[in-house]
């Protein structure tokens, strides 16, 4: 049940990431740690790296408010279930600084890929016989 709540939150975050991708030119073009090909059991650690990253609005044009609201939603902490498990994995997973830094567009694409990977793992774990490769 707790894990389900997490994954539902991940699905909502995908929509927010997709919205932010539309405003990528209005984001500060800063390079941010962007985990990719995250090893098994380090997904939550990588997720927290994405949340900690200083994604910022460039404060230009009419989109500043919607961008700031979306960034705030991305950074909202998930429910505290499994927090202990996440903490345990963090000890053996790469530090945020060790991940390759990418500009906002690639940062958001990698964040989305991680969210999708986590949801897919969750979906597959509840199912038998449809995974092909």
């Amino acid at each position: 049940q707790g894990q389900d709540r997490h994954m539902i939150r991940m699905r909502q975050l995908i929509d927010i990431v997709d919205q932010l991708k539309n405003y990528v030119n209005d984001l500060v073009p800063e390079f941010l740690p962007a985990p990719e090909d995250v090893e098994t059991n380090c997904e939550w650690s990588a997720f927290s790296c994405f949340q900690k990253a200083q994604l910022k609005s460039a404060n230009t044009g009419n989109n500043e408010r919607i961008i700031n609201v979306s960034i705030k939603k991305l950074k909202r902490k998930p429910p505290s279930t499994n927090a202990g498990r996440r903490q345990k994995h963090r000890l053996t997973c790469p530090s945020c600084d060790s991940y390759e830094k990418k500009p906002p567009k690639e940062f958001l694409e990698r964040f989305k890929s991680l969210l999708q990977k986590m949801i897919h793992q969750h979906l597959s774990s509840r199912t038998h016989g449809s995974e092909d490769s």
Epitope: Q1, D4, I8, R11, Q12, I14, D15, D18, E109, K112, S113, Q116, I119, H120, L123, S124, R126, T127, G129, S130, E131, D132, S133
Partner: antibody, heavy 117, light 107 residues
Framework: QVQLQESGPGLVKPSETLSLTCTVS????????WGWIRQPPGKGLEWIGY???????NYNPSLKSRVTISVDTSRNQFSLKLSSVTAADTAVYYC???????????WGQGTLVTVSS | DIQLTQSPSSVSASVGDRVTITCRAS??????LAWYQHKPGKAPKLLIY???SLQSGVPSRFSGSGSGTDFTLTISSLQPEDFATYYC?????????FGGGTKVEIK
């Protein structure tokens, strides 16, 4: 805005292989999940399967032995092959994108495939 | 496989009416349910995901609720462009499955 367009023969003979292609525009096929859903005449929607940006596939167990979904990133296309078709495979076939992994946010308009000799 | 049963199978309503469609799952699916609108010859359109989240660009007159096995799609004030068939889909486990559809017709 992502747009999808199905293409392929509208008529396939029994026991042959149905082949459809979905062309994606307005977005890259190198991310997200790309699926096929069908609707036989007068019936409901049936998920056939999908392929991820990384190439991993999931198929409906009821069709798994006959289905292959593949992706061609250079052409921004993905394809469906359904072997050994029968009249029961007559349907409107839709291709769709799944950003959320398990729901479909963009669909093609569908193409009718009739299986008949 | 998880079966989804939609009711009613069709409903006649007028512009401005409040329309409610229900979807019942054969087993608990938490909030993993999506709703689609489908018009003949057109591409189906995602309205709601994870039971109650409104897809970007969808009018706020559409809302979804429920969890576990019982779910509802509500159109608060039916508009002329809302006459269509609506489908629910479970996103909880493979194979992904759809409900049988509810046709919303003009009274």
């Amino acid at each position: 805005q992502v747009q999808l367009q199905e293409s392929g023969p509208g008529l396939v003979k029994p026991s042959e292989t149905l082949s459809l292609t979905c062309t994606v525009s307005g977005g890259s096929i190198s991310s997200d999940y790309w699926g096929w859903i069908r609707q036989p005449p007068g019936k409901g929607l049936e998920w056939i399967g999908y392929i991820s940006y990384s190439g991993s596939t999931n198929y409906n167990p009821s069709l798994k032995s006959r289905v292959t979904i593949s992706v061609d990133t250079s052409r921004n296309q993905f394809s469906l092959k359904l072997s050994s078709v029968t009249a029961a495979d007559t349907a409107v076939y839709y291709c769709a994108r799944s950003a959320g992994v398990a729901d479909f946010d963009f669909w093609g308009q569908g193409t009718l495939v009739t299986v008949s000799s | 496989d998880i079966q989804l049963t939609q009711s009613p199978s069709s409903v006649s309503a007028s512009v401005g009416d409040r329309v409610t469609i229900t979807c019942r799952a054969s087993q608990g699916i938490s909030s993993w349910l999506a709703w689609y609108q489908h018009k003949p010859g057109k591409a189906p359109k995602l309205l709601i995901y994870v039971a109650s989240s409104l897809q970007s660009g969808v009018p706020s007159r559409f809302s979804g609720s429920g969890s576990g096995t019982d779910f509802t799609l509500t159109i608060s004030s039916l508009q002329p462009e809302d006459f269509a068939t609506y489908y629910c889909q479970q996103a909880s486990s493979f194979p992904l499955t759809f409900g049988g559809g509810t046709k919303v017709e003009i009274k």
